[in-house]
């Protein structure tokens, strides 16, 4: 079994989590990728996923989550904008590779969001940016129902996510367009 490691990100409300998940581009460039949250005692929940096959550098936005898959670089960029305290939790990037089990990328992310004014609103990049705009995109992202031989119960897929605009106030703890996806390592 792969040793699971966690990387802690401590950010303030209003800031942006910006994670770069690397992958072997020759193997996984066009594979569908997802961003999941892992709650204690539960299966990982998929919050957002890229299209299938994944489109190069095409942003997928689900509420305050933006995924960008850079095939040329073997890099999945995940951003969670306008962070809220309730977003705190354990997250991970995965690659869907049916019929095999999902492949976990990178370290798991332990996100801790605290209240308080951020000197760099909307970013965790130490104020080095001079341009940072979230484009008002609308993307339908259908995340697959993943069946694992080790999983006996499986939630049926709900409606496809169709959430737009950067100021969409979706509380990630109450996202309804979620599919439970088992991840084994």
């Amino acid at each position: 079994a792969t040793k699971l490691t966690e990387e802690k990100y401590e950010l303030k409300e209003g800031q942006t989590l910006d994670v770069k998940c690397d992958y072997t581009l020759e193997k996984f460039a066009s594979s569908q990728k997802a961003w999941q949250i892992i709650r204690d005692g539960e299966m990982p929940k998929t919050l957002a996923c890229t299209e299938r096959p994944s489109k190069n550098s095409h942003p997928v936005q689900v509420g305050r989550i933006i995924l960008e898959d850079y095939h040329d670089h073997g890099l999945l960029r995940v951003r969670m904008v306008n962070l809220q305290v309730e977003d705190s939790g354990l997250y991970q990037c995965v690659i869907y590779q049916p019929p095999k089990e999902p492949h976990m990328l990178f370290d798991r992310i332990r996100l801790v969001v605290t209240k308080g004014f951020s000197g760099t609103p909307g970013s965790n990049e130490n104020s080095t940016q001079n341009v940072y705009k979230i484009p008002p995109t609308t993307t339908k992202a259908l995340c697959p129902l993943y069946t694992s031989p080790r999983t006996v119960t499986q939630a049926p897929p709900k409606s496809t996510a169709d959430v737009s605009t950067p100021d969409s106030e979706i509380n990630l703890t109450n996202v309804t367009d979620i599919i439970r996806v088992p991840v084994f390592n």
């Epitope: 802690k8 770069k20 690397d22 190069n56 850079y70 001079n130």
Partner: antibody, heavy 116, light 107 residues
């Protein structure tokens, strides 16, 4: 084959300006972040600036903020670096590179010398 | 700003021997670390990204390891074309920062 060809370097006096250009080919320019990285003579590598495909995100190293401007023309597959108020410490080979975080492909570089 | 420190500054190795280069970050960069090779008079070339993933076309004798703040580039059996300067670079956060480099020279 990916090709990145820089131009526009040369000798300039302190306080002067230069505009570097980079002609890109062999890949889908409009789908890639692009950056400039520099290397002072006999020294190591220093990141200068990065720009997203649609220029919606631009980042600079602190020492060039307010003096340098990175831009791109996706229709012409070209990347630019406008350098104003140049200082002696800006003397370096400037590389045009593909990527916004790590750098998969590099040009051969163009030398910028700031001296009186 | 994340400071990257490489050691040693110079490494003298005989052809066919193993070379181990170290890179340390002043704070955790997770696995967002790349290694580059630069030969004299040439532009750098990406060797490793994601701390341990070989870039396209890079020989298997190059391997990377580590996570967080401590990273290693290993060249299992040095070939004549491997004598060069090697740089590590973090890309967890802007500003992107490089290490000062390790020169691998012939012993």
């Amino acid at each position: 084959e990916v090709q990145l060809v820089e131009s526009g370097g040369g000798l300039v006096q302190p306080g002067g300006s230069l505009r570097l250009s980079c002609a890109a080919s062999g890949f889908t320019f409009s789908s890639n972040w692009m950056s400039w990285v520099r290397q002072a003579p006999g020294k190591g590598l220093d990141w200068v600036a990065s720009i997203k495909q649609d220029a919606s995100e631009i980042y600079y190293v602190e020492s060039v903020k307010g003096r340098f401007t990175i831009s791109r023309d996706n229709a012409k597959n070209s990347l630019h670096l406008q350098m104003n108020s140049l200082r002696a410490e800006d003397t370096a080979v400037y590389y045009c590179v593909r990527g916004g975080w790590r750098f998969e492909s590099w040009g051969q570089g163009t030398l910028v010398t700031v001296s009186s | 700003e994340i400071v990257m420190t490489q050691s040693p500054a110079t490494l003298s190795v005989s052809p066919g021997e193993r070379a181990t280069l170290s890179c340390r970050a002043s704070q955790s960069v997770s696995s967002n670390l790349a290694w580059y090779q630069q030969k004299s008079g040439q532009a750098p070339r990406l060797l490793i990204y994601g701390a341990s993933i070989r870039a396209t076309g890079i020989p298997a004798r190059f391997s990377g390891s580590g996570s967080g703040t401590e990273f290693t580039l290993t060249i299992s059996s040095l070939q004549s074309e491997d004598f060069a300067v090697y740089y590590c670079q973090q890309y967890k956060n802007f500003p992107l920062t490089f290490g000062g480099g390790t020169k691998v020279e012939i012993k």
